[in-house]
């Protein structure tokens, strides 16, 4: 006799208004008496509709929450599993049931903001900027909302960057406990003449950090050939262990690059009689603290002042 189990009931994808953080929820299946004591596990698959691959999780819960790109639709499917303990060693699962979440198509795509860019300066404040949609009326203005886990609800930007009295960006500071988790942004717009398409963005703040450049550079030469360069990590909240550095060394007309995770470097002079010996350095967050990052600006150039030419007394 074939053992059967029903799929979960009332599977749905809900938007609680958190700008892309959605709830997938369901109710337990109708279970025949024989399996009342069995633990049910649910296999949930979900994806944005343009994605090739499904994300799969197994849960004993009746709800699962995750972040999505609300610029695109979402689809999910779920089925019930009975463990082999309950079925005499055979793996039993229900048929799949499906649910989808369609995005709002209010406003044409041309009204949506363009070139959204966000930088988390020195791990201290976030600046996002955008350009207006391709074809919008002159009365169009945009509003930015953001949310991350820890906030009760989505918040609106309180400090807009403006151009011609229009919002073209936002500065956010005091973002407590906001890194190493998804940070959701929605920029929507308003116009009396047409609806404006919303734009959604999601990233993690530690991956878009642009540090300040290193400072207090110093260069010295020992034994006339050993170059010693050192610098200080810039001030601010980024721990020294989180930096990686790129150094450009210039010896007369030749320059070359080097890299290190320390804030000093030793190397040999290329030519004993070189007259010009300078370096400058930039930094970014390293792979131990983030998956990505933005290079700082270059520091000021520092040159060795110990050279004494043939004319020196």
């Amino acid at each position: 006799l074939e053992i059967k189990v029903n799929p979960p009931q009332d599977f749905e994808i809900l938007d609680p208004g958190l700008l892309g953080y959605l709830y997938l929820q369901w109710k337990p299946p109708v279970v025949i008496e024989k399996f009342k004591g069995c633990t049910l596990e649910y296999e949930l698959k979900y994806r944005n509709v343009d994605s090739d691959s499904w994300k799969t999780i197994i849960t004993r819960n009746l709800i699962y929450k995750d972040g999505f790109d609300l610029n695109k639709g979402i689809e999910g499917k779920i089925r019930t599993h009975l463990s082999e303990h309950c079925t005499n060693g055979s793996e039993v699962q229900s048929p799949w049931i499906e649910a989808s979440y369609g995005i709002s198509d209010e406003g044409s795509l041309e009204t949506k903001i363009q070139d959204m860019k966000c930088i988390y300066y020195n791990w201290q404040y976030l600046v996002c900027s955008w350009k207006p949609g391709k074809t919008v009326y002159s009365d169009t203005n945009y509003t930015m909302f953001f949310w991350y886990e820890g906030l009760d609800h989505a918040l609106q930007c309180a400090d807009y960057l403006q151009h011609d009295e229009k919002n073209v960006g936002c500065k956010l500071s005091n973002l407590d406990s906001s890194d190493y988790k998804d940070f959701f942004i929605c920029v929507n717009g308003s116009s009396k003449l047409e609806p404006i398409r919303s734009s959604y963005t999601v990233f993690q703040l530690q991956n878009i950090v642009k540090p300040l450049p290193p400072e207090f550079l110093h260069i010295s030469v020992e034994n006339s050939i050993d170059i010693r360069m050192k610098w200080s990590t810039p001030g601010g909240p980024i721990p020294p262990r989180c930096y990686t550095y790129e150094i450009v060394i210039r010896e007369d007309d030749i320059s070359w690059e080097s890299a290190t995770d320390k804030n000093d470097m030793k190397l040999k002079r290329r030519a004993n009689e070189s007259e010009d010996l300078c370096f400058f350095v930039r930094c970014k967050v390293n792979i131990y603290c983030a998956d990505d990052g933005i290079w700082s600006e270059w520091s000021e150039e520092e040159c060795w002042e110990g050279y004494t030419g043939p004319d020196s007394k």
């Epitope: 849960t59 004993r60 929450k65 463990s83 082999e84 303990h85 060693g89 793996e91």
Partner: antibody, heavy 121, light 108 residues
């Protein structure tokens, strides 16, 4: 008496491969989900992979996905972990563990004694 | 992923003491939580499953409580054999199965 006995550990160079085995006895093997859990020297426990009783469903931690493959031979009462493209951070004691009840993972009521995998050049 | 946070990391206690270890989940895991004991060089040993069910053969001085996101392992009267490292583990949702970072119970 339930017993799980791992073997196959050893020293391997980065980029190399190793196959761990876990021989089981004392329970209805095909009925129970099995997992691999590892512990780096001086560190905590890290779940690696799971397989359902029939072997039809497998699950992996992100850190090993695409490099490790879990499998089982229910006729031989043996669980396997094929480890490819090994890295220094895979160095650990690898335990096989039996799920108390559940389809893929759950509470682990029996553990093997562990086998040490060292990835070093 | 569900994060499991144990506290304290280290606990100094004496034989006969009542000892409590806390485990917090980053989201609700109902009662799908297990506690393990591990001694140096040995495999972990299951103590508690489903948050409060005592595994067969485990002394009754061990007990588990809690549901949702807050869980507790209590040793009512610490014995010499209980000095070890204790781990919590969630099995509500996976992959991945996640463990707490461990609590070392040492002699005061």
């Amino acid at each position: 008496e339930v017993q799980l006995l791992e073997s196959g550990g050893g020293l391997v160079q980065p980029g190399g491969s190793l196959r761990l085995s876990c021989a089981a006895s004392g329970f209805t093997f095909s009925r129970d989900a099995l997992n691999w859990v590892r512990q780096a020297p001086g560190k905590g426990l890290e779940w690696v992979s799971a397989i359902s009783g029939s072997g039809g469903s497998t699950f992996y931690a992100d850190s090993v996905k695409g490099r490790f493959t879990i499998s089982r031979d229910n006729s031989k009462n043996t669980l396997y972990l094929q480890m490819n493209s090994l890295r220094a951070e895979d160095t650990a004691v690898y335990y096989c563990a039996k799920v108390r009840y559940g389809w893929g993972a759950g509470a682990f009521d029996y553990w093997g004694q562990g086998t040490l995998v060292t990835v070093s050049s | 992923d569900i994060q499991m946070t144990q506290s304290p990391s280290t606990l100094s206690a004496s034989v006969g003491d009542r000892v409590t270890i806390t485990c917090r989940a980053s989201q609700s895991i109902s009662s799908w939580l297990a506690w393990y004991q591990q001694k140096p060089g040995k495999a972990p040993k299951l103590l508690i499953y489903d948050a409060s069910s005592l595994e067969s053969g485990v002394p009754s001085r061990f007990s588990g409580s809690g549901s949702g996101t807050e869980f507790t392992l209590t040793i009512s009267s610490l014995q010499p054999d209980d000095f070890a490292t204790y781990y919590c583990q969630q099995y509500d949702t996976y992959p991945p199965i996640t463990f707490g970072q461990g609590t070392k119970v040492e002699i005061k």
